[in-house]
């Protein structure tokens, strides 16, 4: 049982545990999200991602969540149960990122570039919101990210 992001395989992470951690904080996060018109993980970011692209894209998205979203939100959260759930999500994201080794070969340039352009769409949408709103929205959209990632899980 493992994720297969194209040539990149990830062991030891179970989708159910990610969802359970997300649900533990979902109501809190999405209740605070007042901007319902905008979406960060829009269709163009995650739709029709090829297997080869998926390794690059999931790597950049999860790194962004770890370095920008979880890190900043962690400093703003005091509720122990919420922190525990964030930690579960973050630890699993770390485990995934640590196993992803996207190829840096020249012949993969166009695939890498395509994945990067998808990521830039997400980051641009994130930067258009003020920091607090962007963090809340990014956390509220973890379900969109998990739904997409789940497509690459193989038993």
């Amino acid at each position: 049982q493992e994720f297969h992001f194209g040539p990149c395989q990830v062991k030891g992470v179970v989708p159910q545990k990610l969802w359970e951690a997300f649900w533990a904080v979902k109501d809190t996060m999405q209740a605070q999200d007042n901007i319902t018109s905008a979406r960060l993980l829009q269709q163009e970011v995650l739709q029709n991602v090829s297997d080869a692209e998926s390794c690059y894209l999931v790597h950049t998205l999860l790194e962004f969540y770890l370095k920008t979203v979880f890190k900043n939100y962690h400093n703003r959260t005091v509720e122990v149960r919420t922190l525990k759930s964030f930690s579960t999500l973050a630890n699993n994201f770390v485990l995934i990122v640590s196993q992803l080794q996207p190829s840096q070969e020249n012949e993969m340039f166009s695939i890498r570039d395509s994945a990067h352009r998808r990521f830039l769409l997400f980051r641009r949408a994130f930067k258009q919101l003020d920091v607090e709103a962007a963090l809340t929205k990014a956390l509220g959209e973890v379900d969109i990210l998990l739904t997409w990632m789940q497509k690459f899980y193989k038993l």
Epitope: Q16, W19, W23, Q43, L46, T147, Q150, F152, Y153, L155
Partner: antibody, heavy 119, light 108 residues
Framework: ELQLVESGGGSVQPGGSLRLSCAAS????????MYWVRQAPGKGLEWLSL????????FYADSVKGRFTISRDNAKNTLYLQMNSLKSEDTAVYYC????????????WGQGTQVTVSA | SYELTQSPSVSVAQRQTAKITCGGD??????AQWYQQKPGQAPVMVIY???RRPSGIPERFSGSNSGNTATLTISGAQAEDEADYYC???????????FGGGTHLTVL
């Protein structure tokens, strides 16, 4: 061999209650999400409820929210569905199902138990 | 609420290819599952995560999912494939498992 066996079905009057059970064997019950799905006579499949591994999260279809309650006893390897305020439109075959392991994928099903709600 | 739309019936000649479709708003971003149900029996999963086959399911069953349509393909349909087929996905905004209305496959 993996087995899911439903029981507790039967006939009941409108407004009445029933408790369905699903006895699981052949796998580590506590590691999997479980579901209840029903099928009215001549109709399609209708999802009713989902419960996570430890019962920490439960979800329901709008049609049964507030009337049905899903629960599990991991020590007894058993899934339950408490059905209250039953209506004639609840008449159906009720199936329990086990997640495949990838999430939201109903990989194994019981044979079902018939519930008839009629005056 | 999220809806999955299937045509009620599809016919295919034996040993020909059958395609059963499932329409849903941006279903390509979700994981699609397919179930086979024969009369008087419980459903059986034939495809999960868009295109993956559970063990024991014949290779003639395959799946794809893109845009607004998920497709179940049966290459070289056999008489025993005659059944009802249901697609299914998870609607994360409503926290609900959603089934399509079902398609009856007739193998001529």
């Amino acid at each position: 061999e993996l087995q899911l066996v439903e029981s507790g079905g039967g006939s009941v009057q409108p407004g009445g209650s029933l408790r369905l059970s699903c006895a699981a064997s052949g796998f580590t019950f506590s590691n999997y999400w479980m579901y209840w799905v029903r099928q009215a006579p001549g109709k399609g499949l209708e999802w009713l409820s989902l419960i996570t591994t430890d019962g920490g999260s439960t979800f329901y279809a709008d049609s049964v929210k507030g009337r049905f309650t899903i629960s599990r006893d991991n020590a007894k390897n058993t899934l339950y569905l408490q059905m209250n305020s039953l209506k004639s439109e609840d008449t159906a075959v009720y199936y329990c199902a086990k997640d495949l392991g990838s999430g939201f994928s109903l990989g194994s099903w019981g044979q079902g138990t018939q519930v008839t709600v009629s005056a | 609420s999220y809806e999955l739309t299937q045509s009620p019936s599809v016919s295919v000649a034996q040993r020909q290819t059958a395609k059963i479709t499932c329409g849903g708003d941006n279903i390509g971003s979700k994981s699609a599952q397919w179930y086979q149900q024969k009369p008087g029996q419980a459903p059986v999963m034939v495809i999960y995560s868009d295109s993956r086959r559970p063990s024991g399911i014949p290779e003639r069953f395959s799946g794809s999912n893109s845009g607004n349509t998920a497709t179940l393909t049966i290459s070289g349909a056999q008489a025993e494939d005659e059944a009802d087929y249901y697609c299914q996905a998870w609607d994360s905004s409503a926290n609900a498992v959603v089934f399509g209305g079902g398609t009856h496959l007739t193998v001529l």
